[in-house]
């Protein structure tokens, strides 16, 4: 069951996922001059069985030089940020290998992709927060959010996070700070 | 709470156009994809089209492309169906559904009647 | 495209159980695990009732359930009760990245 709403929005923070659960969509984005190719896939699914999950159909962009219809080229990263999106992760980024069953872990960058990547979650999905470059965490609780379903209606659970402006970066749970990440941005992903 | 909203039956003549319209409302309207779905009176269900409001790009079935224009105005989650010359035979009931995981459409509108007689 | 077969009506009595099959080809319902199923009350839209071949969304009963072999789909109705009777359609995601609809099956519920 998809989650309705966004995850809750913190005052100077970010959250994103560790592992993404089954049912998951990643909406296949293309950057500004670029769009799906006409046959290609719509959106990325985290699907599988109980011993293994990956995401299903590739993103693919091309130019929209090549479009011959009058239809409009993918809007500019900074309309994309509107919900359920997250940071693309670097293509360098070493991913750690360890299982987390039942979900996907970050699907790789594909060519010619958005900055912004818009995620559909469902619910079980738990995202994670932290304090953005210059900002650090005070009074800190759970720094973590759940879909949840109520009463046939989904909800995200509120994380107890305040981050305070002192140019000091926190980390996601159980993260020493990267030393070559000047966005503060995890090391390594829980994979599946 | 999520829904998408259809706007109200239309009585048309042949050769009049038509601009028909499904707002997405309780959901991040821009970031899913609307398809069209047409029934004719007492027949089943024919998948026309799809659009994502986020940059518009637009799919068609083979059997409705050139015959119809979906469109959308993300600044108001709002998809369209047009048509720009009605004939008889465009007389149906058109649903929008949201395209949501596994590829289903999860949620539908209510649909719109559409009657073009003479 | 051509429409997903469907056959046309079945029935059955109340308790019993029916199974409704929908027959694509390897481009349609044979390429993917996308194969959908919806029920079409008298006058109402469509409700989506299985997706993924097999899962149902929350709310469905589990007296519903999905199968798939080859490039057939099949919906089958546990228990059926009197509110059961409707239209079925099946629908399945191509691969030229479009949808394809079955051509419905009408169930009555006997007596």
């Known amino acids: 069951e998809l989650c309705d709403d966004d995850p809750p929005e913190i005052p100077h923070a970010t959250f994103k996922a560790m592992a993404y659960k089954e049912g998951t969509m990643l909406n296949c984005e293309c950057k500004r001059g670029f769009r799906r190719i006409k046959s290609g896939s719509l959106y990325m699914l985290c699907t599988g069985n109980s011993s293994h999950s990956s995401w299903d159909n590739q993103c693919q962009c091309t130019s929209s030089a090549t479009r011959n219809t009058t239809k409009q080229v993918t809007p500019q990263p900074e309309e994309q940020k509107e919900r359920k999106t997250t940071e693309m992760q670097s293509p360098m980024q070493p991913v750690d290998q360890a299982s987390l069953p039942g979900h996907c872990r970050e699907p790789p960058p594909w060519e010619n992709e958005a900055t912004e990547r818009i995620y559909h979650f469902v619910v079980g999905q738990m995202v994670y927060y932290q304090c953005v470059q210059g900002y650090r965490a005070l009074h800190r609780g759970p720094a973590e959010s759940v879909c949840k379903m109520t009463h046939g209606k989904t909800r995200w659970t509120q994380p107890q996070l305040i981050c305070t402006g002192e140019m000091e970066t926190s980390q996601f749970p159980g993260e020493e700070k990267p030393q070559a990440s000047p966005e503060g941005r995890p090391e390594s992903e829980t994979s599946c | 709470q999520v829904q998408l909203v259809q706007s109200g039956a239309e009585v048309k003549k042949p050769g009049e156009s038509l601009k028909i319209s499904c707002k997405g409302s309780g959901y991040s309207s821009t970031s899913y994809w609307i398809g069209w779905v047409r029934q004719m009176p007492g027949k089943g269900l024919e998948w026309m089209g799809i659009?994502?409001?986020?940059?518009?790009?637009?799919r068609y079935s083979p059997s409705f492309q050139g015959q119809v224009t979906i469109s959308a105005d993300k600044s108001i989650s709002t998809a369209y169906l047009q048509w720009s010359s009605l004939k008889a035979s465009d007389t149906a009931m058109y649903y929008c559904?949201?395209?949501?995981?596994?590829?289903?459409?999860?949620?539908w509108g209510r649909g719109t009647m559409v009657t073009v007689s003479s | 495209q051509s429409a997903l077969t469907q056959p046309a009506s079945v029935s059955a009595s109340p308790g019993q159980s029916i199974t409704i099959s929908c027959t694509g080809t390897?481009?349609?319902?044979?390429?993917?695990?996308?194969v959908s199923w919806y029920q079409q009350l008298s006058g109402k839209p469509p409700k989506l009732i299985l997706y993924d071949v097999s899962k149902r969304p929350s709310g469905i009963s589990d007296r519903f359930s999905g199968s798939k072999s080859g490039n057939t789909a099949s919906l089958t109705i546990s228990g059926l009760q009197a509110d059961d009777e409707a239209d079925y359609y099946c629908s399945s995601y191509t691969r030229s990245s479009t949808w394809v609809f079955g051509g419905g099956t009408q169930l009555t519920v006997l007596g």
């Open positions: 659009i994502y409001p986020g940059d518009s790009d637009t």
């Open positions: 559904a949201r395209l949501g995981s596994a590829y289903a459409f999860d949620i």
């Open positions: 390897s481009s349609d319902v044979g390429a993917y695990i996308y």
